[in-house]
């Protein structure tokens, strides 16, 4: 906490500029117009001040907007967001994608702190509904978002904004997730044509039932074993040696390298050996 | 992680010059401010020059007309040019941009001795 003292004279500053970095920390305190400072917010992510100087110019804004700060001023926050704290944060009411950008651009290349989560939050709950543009915002710079949320979180996501997920948006995301993003994509694809159908539903089959699986078994899709890996072992026991082969196609090799390793090794045990040997791959049931 | 790397600090008489360099290793120069600090022992840090992205430079009232800095963006490097220095500007030297100085990420400084 800086003390209250008179501003020296002449050091009143007219403007928000670079030669406020020569400032002690209580000269800032003195002779900074919070007022000002809110207008020109802008410009403060342009000048090198010193993370104690920031403290000086957030403490200004906390006071000067008690019950939280206006958008207005959050959108020109820059580097002084990283001082916010998560309770700061819950006090915003954040609306327009450009801030949500404009803070999330102060934070890129780190990983996703605590006041990065609770932003977001505010932000996605404030819209009622993950929508495409948050989302493609979202998995932009954080690629790994979406598997960050729980599956009460992702049935908010409404199917229109599946077509912004990229593949590796979904590589942390555990069977729960897909089980409820995979309904949501098959919706959103619906109208697609099988090959174009199958690359775009292909990182989500991870929530697949065994009868879409069989669905799929009968377009030549030839999945690869990466994507075989990931289904969820109780859709993929109750398919035939042959429905297998068709789905994965000239992949089907690739099984006795898998093996050992669910969902194959589970599958394997499930199916009668004269219907794995029609394979010719060796797999012992 | 962007690295910033201050050199050209020593031991030098009262009245003597020094020219401190700062090498970053990557392209932050070109879009950004940047500023010299120094810290002297048991003293906060303080700021002593900036120069902005277009080139325009500030001193602090303390250096002013005996310190100049200067930028070369095509070589991510500043310079802190030393002249007339006193016993009192004896401190370690930083140098930093808007991002490095509000995340308190600082390069190892260079010492700079004053003294007969």
């Known amino acids: 906490e800086v003390e209250k003292t008179a501003c020296p004279s002449g050091k009143k500053a007219p403007e928000i500029d670079e030669s406020l970095i020569f400032y002690k920390k209580w000269e800032l305190e003195a002779c900074v117009d919070a007022a000002l400072l809110a207008t020109q917010m802008d410009r403060v992510n342009a000048i090198p001040f010193t993370y104690e100087q920031l403290d000086v110019l957030k403490h200004k804004l906390d006071e000067l907007y008690p019950q939280g700060y206006p958008e207005s001023v959050i959108q020109h926050l820059g580097y002084l967001f990283l001082k916010m704290s998560p309770e700061d944060i819950r006090k915003w009411n954040v609306t327009s994608l450009e801030t949500l950008k404009a803070l999330l651009e102060v934070n890129k290349g780190h990983e996703m702190s605590p006041q990065v989560a609770t932003l977001i939050d505010r932000f996605v709950k404030g819209r009622g509904q993950l929508d495409k543009d948050t989302l493609d915002t979202l998995t932009a710079f954080y690629p790994g978002y979406l598997c960050s949320l729980s599956p009460e979180e992702l049935s908010s996501v409404p199917p229109s904004s599946i077509w912004a997920v990229r593949p590796q948006d979904l590589d942390t995301c555990d069977p729960r997730q897909l089980d409820v993003l995979y309904p949501k994509a098959r919706l959103a694809f619906q109208n697609m044509n099988g090959s174009e159908y199958f690359v775009k539903i292909q990182s989500f089959l991870g929530g697949a039932p065994t009868e879409d699986l069989k669905a799929l078994s009968q377009q030549n899709v030839s999945m690869d074993l990466a994507t075989f890996m990931k289904l969820r072992t109780d859709a993929v026991l109750p398919l035939t040696v042959a429905e297998v082969q068709k789905l994965l196609g000239p992949h089907v090799e690739g099984l006795k390298a898998e093996e050992r390793h669910r969902p194959v090794r589970d599958w394997i045990l499930r199916q009668r050996q004269d219907d794995l040997d029609t394979l010719g791959l060796g797999l012992q049931g | 992680q962007v690295q910033l790397v201050e050199s050209g600090g020593g031991l030098v008489q009262p009245g003597g010059s020094l020219r401190l360099s700062c090498a970053a290793s990557g392209s932050i120069f070109s879009g950004n401010a940047v500023a010299w600090y120094r810290q002297a022992p048991g003293k906060e840090r303080e700021a002593v020059a900036v120069?902005?992205?277009?080139?325009?430079?500030k001193y602090a009232d303390s250096v002013k007309g005996r310190f100049t800095i200067s930028r070369y963006n095509a070589k991510n490097i500043a310079y802190l040019q030393m002249n007339s220095l006193k016993p009192e500007d004896t401190a370690v030297y930083y140098c930093?941009?808007?991002?490095?100085?509000?995340?308190?990420?600082w390069g190892q400084g260079t010492q700079v001795t004053v003294s007969s």
């Open positions: 930093n941009t808007a991002r490095g100085a509000a995340v308190d990420s």
């Open positions: 120069i902005t992205r277009d080139g325009d430079t």
